[in-house]
Amino acid sequence: EVEKTACPSGKKAREIDESLIFYKKWELEACVDAALLATQMDRVNAIPFTYEQLDVLKHKLDELYPQGYPESVIQHLGYLFLKMSPEDIRKWNVTSLETLKALLEVNKGHEMSPQVATLIDRFVKGRGQLDKDTLDTLTAFYPGYLCSLSPEELSSVPPSSIWAVRPQDLDTCDPRQLDVLYPKARLAFQNMNGSEYFVKIQSFLGGAPTEDLKALSQQNVSMDLATFMKLRTDAVLPLTVAEVQKLLGPHVEGLKAEERHRPVRDWILRQRQDDLDTLGLGLQGGIPNGYLVLDLSMQEALS
């Protein structure tokens, strides 16, 4: 903390300019008027202040706005944003996407900080839903943003926003998150033709049910193995050998390399060995000929 000392004669700041970088820390505190600072915030980022000097300027603004900064000040914070705590940010009401972008720019190249997470949370809650423009902005700065949300939070994403999602934005999503996102993506892309639809829906397929995978197998999509390995095991198990062959197309040969890994391993155990042999890949572990397969889950459902 900077001690309260009187401003030396002739040092009172008449405007926010470069002369302030030569001030002692206590002189900045004593000689810069908070109201002047607030009206000339746009100048702060044009002056080569150190982080420590920004600390003092923040302290001045805190005294002027104990209930939280107005958006007119927030939009000009620039690198002063890095000195804010999550507690400070919770007092703000940020409504402009331009303000959000300006503050995210400051943290660019760094991991998402608690300050940024709080800012995004405040902004999204203020809007009521994660609209396309906001999602576009957030995923541009933080590709993993979408996967940091809980399934409950993802449920507020409107299908129209899904158009802003890039494949890399889903890299760290788990099956529970994809379960929520897949139906939205299916709805968003429903009017596209077969091949274009598959290109768009592909990264969301980790949330697809069996019936949708069966439908895709009839469309010559040639799903790659990386996508297939991310499918829900429970959605893959009911697929027949013929359906998987159609789904993967020329990529079906890749099954051999993945035969020990889920969901391929579990799927093989459910197929007749005769059927697997038709692929000519040497896949082993299927149900031997002459064995009767009882689907106990089906039996339970009927009783």
């Epitope: 030569f22 002692k24 044009a46 982080y51 420590e52 890095l82 190249g109």
Partner: antibody, heavy 118, light 112 residues
């Protein structure tokens, strides 16, 4: 993890201009500011200057008349030029970045030795 | 001549406590600006040891501590170990120069 790498000629003739580049990898050059610091053999550290995200620069007054620091965001690099060099400018030159929100340098390049000699 | 003054050398036996002082003036440490400390092992770049007078970055052992008072600051190392043998530098901002200034460095020798 952000890494810095200095590059440039290891030998410069007296009265010529020393030119070094710092390449930033694993992160964006859009941090608040970046620095050049040097260390003559067997001596202490001397801050040369800093360049801000918006191109603003500030230099050590003792070197100000000879120093230019510039940035190239498209290449994720920033550069140092020191003109009219003498043997006294022989040093290891480091580029460094401050810790986020703190004026302490937590990321340094490994340094590059520059000798001024004819 | 460095703006911040440090003793050229200090030494101590393993397990002992040593302190390194850093003396400034009214335009840097005495102006209220923070002090940061670096450790430099031979042939390597400096490594941040203490920032903001007394804060340790993650990974720095709690044997290292810093403090500041008036126009000076100090670095204390307890439970001295052979790997602590290095050069130590203090740094602060100088308002009259509008730039960072360093101490001349202190060579720490761990006696065997």
């Amino acid at each position: 993890q952000v890494q810095l790498q200095e590059s440039g000629p290891g030998l410069v003739k007296p009265s010529e201009t020393l030119s070094l580049t710092c390449t930033v990898s694993g992160g964006s050059i859009s941090s608040y500011y970046w620095n050049w610091i040097r260390q003559p053999p067997g001596k202490g550290l001397e801050w040369i200057g800093r360049i801000y995200y918006n191109g603003n620069t500030y230099y050590n007054p003792s070197l100000k008349s000879r120093v230019t620091i510039s940035g190239d965001t498209s290449k994720n690099q920033f550069s140092l030029k020191l003109s009219s060099v003498t043997a006294a400018d022989t040093a290891v030159y480091y580029c460094a970045r401050p810790k986020l929100g703190i004026d302490a340098f937590d990321i340094w390049g490994q340094g590059t030795m520059v000798t001024v000699s004819s | 001549q460095s703006v911040l003054t440090q003793p050229p050398s200090v030494s101590g036996a393993p397990g002992q406590r040593v302190t390194i002082s850093c003396t400034g003036s009214s335009s840097n440490i005495g102006a209220g600006y923070d002090v940061h400390w670096y450790q430099q092992l031979p042939g390597t770049a400096p490594k941040l040891l203490i920032y903001g007078n007394s804060n340790r970055p993650s990974g720095v052992p709690d044997r290292f501590s810093g403090s500041k008072s008036g126009t000076s600051a100090s670095l204390a190392i307890t439970g001295l170990q052979a790997e602590d043998e290095a050069d130590y530098y203090c740094q602060s901002y100088d308002s009259s120069l509008s730039g960072w200034v360093f101490g001349g460095g202190t060579k720490l020798t761990v006696l065997s």
